[in-house]
Every structure is written in C-alpha cells, then in structure tokens.
C-alpha cells in the first residue's frame, strides 16, 4: 500500500499479498433476484443490465437459478466465498466460468454457480459437457 494511504484495522475492503500488491475487486452482474425465461437450455444470459463493483476484493460472482411450480428466477450477486450462500459453500469460486450445479432444496429445482472473472455470472452454463462433477 502506498505510504500516504492509511492502513486501517480490520480492513476487508483491501486485500494485499505478501509483497504488498493490491487485489482489484471483481466486476459482477448484480441484479439480485429477477424473473427469468431461462429453462431447458445449455446456457443462458443473465439479462441483467447492472454490472457492479463488488464491495470487497475477495468477493466473487454468483448466480442462482430456481424453478418451482409458479416461476423461474435468476439471482445475480457478489459474495464472499468464505461464507455460505443459501446454505451452500461456493466450491467453484476460482472458476473463470459460471458452471451451474444442482443443489438439493425441497420443493424446487435449485442450481448455483460462482466464478471469478469479470462479469462471469452473465453467462450461466448448464451443459453437461462443462459440468463434470456430481451435484450435491
């Protein structure tokens, strides 16, 4: 950190490595929960027009696709991978692509992905050719 920039206690707004280099924050689609027409497709665009700077540099991009008897929604947010989201760990946070994985949620079909390249949660991928691991 440059000498004229104050260091503050418990500062999670800045992340530095051992050499003092600074990590830039992620740029993610961030529309929270929106109704979606994405269904039975190998991949979908988020149709979220808001790209936001994540508040903390350690945060990654997340997308959550949910389908129940009434509707389909797609949630796009930033989130810290050290913390669970919707009670699930973000196992794929280092991935450059948002590869959807199904999670068990009663009463709905629930897929979630996370990724760490700019706006990577704009393109959500359901295709089995990308998804090599078993769903939880």
């Amino acid at each position: 950190i440059p000498p004229h920039v104050q260091k503050s206690v418990n500062n999670d707004m800045i992340v530095t490595d051992n050499n003092g280099a600074v990590k830039f924050p992620q740029l993610c689609k961030f529309c929270d929960v929106r109704f979606s027409t994405c269904d039975n497709q190998k991949s979908c665009m988020s149709n979220c027009s808001i790209t936001s700077i994540c508040e903390k540099p350690q945060e990654v991009c997340v997308a959550v696709w949910r389908k129940n008897d009434e509707n389909i929604t797609l949630e796009t947010v930033c989130h810290d991978p050290k913390l669970p989201y919707h009670d699930f760990i973000l196992e794929d946070a280092a991935s450059p692509k948002c590869i959807m994985k199904e999670k068990k949620k009663p009463g709905e079909t629930f897929f979630m992905c996370s990724c760490s390249s700019d706006e990577c949660n704009d393109n959500i991928i359901f295709s089995e050719e990308y998804n090599t691991s078993n769903p939880d």
Partner: nanobody, 124 residues
C-alpha cells in the same frame, strides 16, 4: 516516470456537486482500466468506479450508483469523476489508480503508482 495527479477536491455542502480530475503521464493511458478509489477518515479503501480503456464501459459501487459518473478523455490522458447529490458519507480522500484489464493484482506495492489523492469534504 509514471504519474497520476488528482485534483478538484474541496469543501461542498450536502446535495452539492464536484468534478474530480486525474492527469496521467508516463504510461500508455489507452491500455489501462482506470479506477477511482476513496478512503474516508479512519476507514478502509472503497472502490468507487472504473472505466474501460476503450469503449468507455463504466462500473460503479452500489453506494454511488446514479450519483457519480466516471469518464475519461484519452486524447488528454485524463480521468474524471463527476459527483452529484453529495452526502456526508462521501467525505474521503479520492485516488485514481490504473489496472491492466483482466489482471487481478497490481504489479507492486505502490498500486501501480497512486497519486497523492484529493480531499473531498461534504459538510454544512
């Protein structure tokens, strides 16, 4: 020598406006994503806004979206931040910084060369 020189800060009343400038030299301005970053007294850094080198795509923190506008003039190697509807919580030192698009980390501990910053004080 790489230099970033911020200016335009000052004292403004709540609801007022300011325009910050950052004059860049010593590097190829059109190769870098540029950022405005701020630090309020006694607090950590907050990433305020960014703009792509070409095409002028812009990004904002949720705290300033709709109130602040980032822009750049590549012919003048200058970055701008138009700040409207200013609030007391916008009081901070504002810095500009440069980033190679797609690169996650700065090259060194000097944040790829910070400027000295410009102080914005919002108070009645």
């Amino acid at each position: 020598e790489v230099q970033l020189l911020e200016s335009g800060g000052g004292l403004v009343q709540p609801g007022g406006s300011l325009r910050l400038s950052c004059a860049a030299s010593g590097f190829t301005f059109t190769e870098y994503r540029m950022w405005w970053v701020r630090q309020a007294p006694g607090k950590g850094l907050e990433w305020v806004s960014a703009i792509e080198p070409i095409g002028n795509r812009t990004y904002y923190a949720k705290s300033v979206g709709g109130r602040f506008t980032i822009s750049r003039d590549n012919s003048k190697n200058t970055l701008y931040l138009q700040m409207n509807s200013l609030r007391a919580e916008d009081t901070a030192v504002y810095y500009c910084a440069k980033q190679i698009p797609g690169r996650k980390w700065t090259a060194n501990s000097r944040f790829d060369y910070w400027g000295q910053g410009t102080l914005v004080t919002v108070s009645s």
